[in-house]
């Protein structure tokens, strides 16, 4: 007779996970040098005691806290690119300003972007079949509870100017309900953060309008200015051109504006 | 502005002590956790030790817990961690930093210790 299994809302845990975090890992200790001593079954031994044999709603920050230590990692704290609803495009800059870092180009984000995972309380089997969902079953999961601890102290460690990549193409360009909205900005360090810098990112070819006048821009604003840091605000009305520029600085039509 | 200075390093014969010490200013010091993060020759950085801001909780790695402590003085802004029984393996530039990582943006250059015989 086989076991009965709770069935959650959301998908199950990314298939091959754990060949896939220890693979990622490997990756990423290979390509950066200054991480070349983790110890990557010692970091995979971490991450999976953080769910395993736990309930799937009952995840805390301490569970994750072995795996923190692990990922001690140098992050120059002026040099933090934030983002909301336009992921690609902010690793597509990253990748080409390699002295700016996201979440997921340090190795924690970078082991754990875009998978799902949980577990089962009191076995030690991995629960390919169904996740919680954040909405509907619970907000404390092994998923949602990671990027909530590692989001916190990312903003934590940001000083400075910081920057924040948002989707101009959304109906709330600022959406007080995103990672960003609900973690980040409010553990930005009013005594290390001067400036937080929005980077609204436009869509449409011919969109000339100043989405920084957008009311969850001024929302933003808003809330940025009562925790007593500083806010400015850029259109990127040519996202692609933006990249182009970033790529070639001295190309005589990156003078003008993106 | 963050600004450390870290302190109180030498050259320990192994099973020794050494109090290490880190000066902070430009911040409201008791506002922030603390750690001791350290860089051994040729290899990455390592967490060590986290303090809360009013100093009632503490945290170590495990290759340091019963032998290291870790506190501070709110008063004078100053950050210790008190080494004993000192290995080899615990040869390494130690920062003090704020927060309690996993990412750190060390100010200081660091104290060097040196556990030989």
């Known amino acids: 007779v086989p076991r009965w299994r709770q069935q959650w809302s959301g998908p199950g845990t990314t298939k091959r996970f754990p060949e896939t975090v220890l693979a990622r890992c490997v990756k990423y200790t290979e390509i950066h040098p200054e991480m070349r001593h983790v110890d990557c079954q010692s970091v995979w031994d971490a991450f999976k005691g953080a769910f395993i044999s736990k309930h799937p709603c009952n995840i805390t920050e301490e569970d994750y806290q072995p795996l923190m230590k692990l990922g001690t990692q140098t992050v120059p704290c002026n040099k933090i690119l934030l983002w909301s609803r336009i992921k690609d495009l902010a690793h597509q800059f990253t990748q080409v300003q390699r002295d700016m870092f996201t979440l997921e180009d340090t190795l924690l984000g970078y082991l754990a972007d875009d998978l799902t995972w949980c577990g089962e309380f009191n076995t030690s089997k991995i629960n390919y079949q169904s996740c919680p969902d954040w909405r509907k079953d619970c907000s404390n999961n092994p998923v949602s509870v990671f990027w909530k601890t590692v989001s916190r102290r990312f903003a934590e460690a940001a000083c400075d100017v910081v920057h924040v990549m948002l989707n101009g193409s959304r109906s709330k360009i600022f959406d007080k309900n995103s990672t960003f909205g609900s973690v980040e900005v409010h553990n930005l360090q009013p005594e290390k953060v001067q400036t937080l810098e929005a980077w609204v990112i436009h869509g449409g070819r011919e969109d000339s309008r100043d989405l920084c006048q957008d009311p969850t821009i001024k929302e933003l604003e808003s809330i940025i200015s009562k925790r007593n840091i500083q806010f400015s605000c850029k259109n990127i009305y040519r996202p692609d051109k933006f990249l182009q520029c970033v790529k070639n600085p001295e190309d005589s039509s990156c003078t003008s504006e993106i | 502005e963050v600004q450390v200075l870290e302190s109180g390093g030498g050259l320990v014969q192994p099973g020794g002590s050494l109090r290490l010490s880190c000066a902070a200013s430009?911040?409201?010091?008791?506002?922030?956790?603390m750690s001791w993060v350290r860089q051994a020759p040729g290899k990455g950085l390592e967490w060590v030790s986290a303090?809360?801001?009013?100093?009632?909780?503490?945290d170590y790695a495990d290759s340091v817990k019963g032998r290291f402590t870790i506190s501070r003085d709110n008063s004078n802004n100053t950050l210790y961690l008190q080494m004993n029984s000192l290995r080899a393996e615990d040869t390494a530039v130690y920062y003090c930093?704020?927060?309690?990582?996993?990412?750190?943006?060390?100010r200081g250059q660091g104290t060097l210790v040196t556990v030989s015989s």
């Open positions: 930093a704020d927060g309690t990582g996993p990412f750190f943006d060390y």
């Open positions: 430009g911040f409201t010091f008791s506002n922030f956790a």
């Open positions: 303090i809360s801001g009013s100093g009632g909780s503490t």
